[in-house]
Interface confidence: medium
């Protein structure tokens, strides 16, 4: 709406930056052949470029990216009972962001 | 894979709180009723609840909300010409949260 | 507090049958998985049973298994186990103990322990 | 049925390293739990998931686990840390515990 405007603070772009953000272990990373089996944690924390860049024709990109492997446990459900195994899945950290120009063509307007 | 366990840090959950997230600002926001305009900002940083939570039947939900106006650049395009204006978007911010029950019946094993 | 209170144990003969009870408070008993680890006399711990959070899903030790039932109520935020056709070598100090998970993992929160004696 | 194998007893002198080992069959494998229990107490949890520490638990307790063996390593060990140490694995359905270890502070 365009009422209230006194008390309403100026928005701040959201900069091209990494911030934190919480990635999902699904369990098509760590075995596409089975699903009888649960992760633990199921989620986890990584650092992932995000916000908006000054110009339409860019767009925020990482420019550093660091793989990291971690160890979650696989709970295998056999005959209805568990078994706890450890797998490793590998998290992809970005360690620095960029506005960068898109490389796709541009629709002919 | 199951290798390389050496190496891997046991992988911390993600727990349930705020965390700083991009919102994108979109269009519908300020006028449903026409799309000749552009935003800027075109996203802001909001504080919103994410990560998991210790049990199944649980999920990460906000227990206290509040709303944050913030002042955006409304830019109307006008036989070619842009006409500067100021529009308030009220956005959400999440304070604190809470692993809450989820109401939904579990599927019986 | 977060502790768990335990009660029930005493002098039972061979047999015979007892229930010991484990009280919950401070926290949330309703997501937690429980269980039963005992140790007897100048002994070691051995897990006995345990219950996940909701309970739906139940283990046993091969030694107590078909005699020993566990159960929970998570409306009286309390633990249960029924001890049934009880032998000499069930003497024990029983605890009841905490999962910080629905699906196990370690033993966060112990129980102060209750002795079971079998005994003719 | 799964096995977890600990020396019945270790010596250390105060100030020194302390360690304390548990084996069992592809323990890497599992994730392994170190309990700590003083004469007439219940357990207290000193190590889990291999190497993690709870909140309260003093910086001179670790743990490792690869292959075969688990290892729980006091260093700088004190007279407050005599006691008996168990080790412990959730494996096929059943929560194992080692025979356990006594902790002698000379």
């Known amino acids: 709406s365009l009422g209230s405007l006194t008390i309403a603070e100026p928005a701040m772009i959201a900069e091209c930056k990494t911030r934190t953000e919480v990635f999902e272990i699904s369990r098509r990373l760590i075995d596409r052949t089975n699903a009888n089996f649960l992760v633990w944690p199921p989620c986890v924390e990584v650092q992932r470029c995000s916000g908006c860049c000054n110009n339409r024709n860019v767009q925020c990109r990482p420019t550093q990216v660091q793989l990291r492997p971690v160890q979650v446990r696989k709970i295998e459900i056999v005959r209805k009972k568990p078994i706890f195994k450890k797998a490793t899945v590998t998290l992809e950290d970005h360690l620095a962001c960029k506005c960068e120009t898109v490389a796709a063509a541009r629709p002919v307007t | 894979s199951l290798g390389s366990l050496t190496i891997a840090e046991p992988a911390m959950i993600a727990e349930c709180k705020t965390r700083t997230e991009v919102f994108e600002i979109s269009r519908r926001l300020i006028d449903r009723t026409n799309a000749n305009f552009l935003v800027w900002p075109p996203c802001v940083e909001v504080q919103r609840c994410s990560g998991c939570c210790n049990n199944r039947n649980v999920q990460c939900r906000p227990t206290q909300v509040q709303l944050r106006p913030v002042q955006v650049r409304k830019i109307e395009i006008v036989r070619k010409k842009p006409i500067f204006k100021k529009a308030t978007v009220t956005l959400e911010d999440h304070l604190a949260c809470k692993c809450e029950t989820v109401a939904a019946a579990r599927p019986v094993t | 507090e977060v502790q768990l209170l335990q009660s029930g144990g005493g002098l039972v003969k061979p047999g015979g049958s007892l229930r010991l009870s484990c009280a919950a408070s401070g926290f949330t008993f309703s997501s937690y998985a429980m269980s039963w680890v005992r140790q007897a006399p100048g002994k070691g711990l051995e897990w006995v049973s345990y219950i996940s959070d909701d309970g739906s899903l139940k283990y046993y030790a091969d030694s107590v298994k078909g005699r020993f039932t566990i159960s929970r109520d998570n409306s009286k935020n309390t633990l249960y186990l029924q001890m049934n056709s009880l032998r000499a070598e069930d003497t024990a100090v029983y605890y009841c103990?905490?999962?910080?998970?629905?699906?196990?993992?370690?033993?966060?929160?112990w129980g102060q322990g209750t002795l079971v004696t079998v005994s003719s | 049925s799964y096995e977890l194998t600990q020396p019945p007893s270790v010596s250390v002198s105060p100030g020194q390293t302390a360690s304390i080992t548990c084996s069992g069959d592809s323990l890497g494998s599992y994730f392994v739990h170190w309990y700590q229990q003083k004469p007439g107490q219940s357990p207290v949890l000193v190590i889990y998931?291999?190497?993690n520490r709870p909140s309260g638990i003093p910086e001179r307790f670790s743990g490792s686990n690869s292959g075969n063996t688990a290892t729980l390593t006091i260093s700088g060990t004190q007279a407050m840390d005599e006691a008996d140490y168990y080790c412990s694995a959730f494996t096929h359905n059943s929560n194992v515990f080692g025979g356990g270890t006594k902790l002698t502070v000379l």
């Open positions: 998931d291999d190497s």
């Open positions: 103990a905490r999962h910080p998970y629905w699906y196990g993992g370690q033993l966060d929160l």
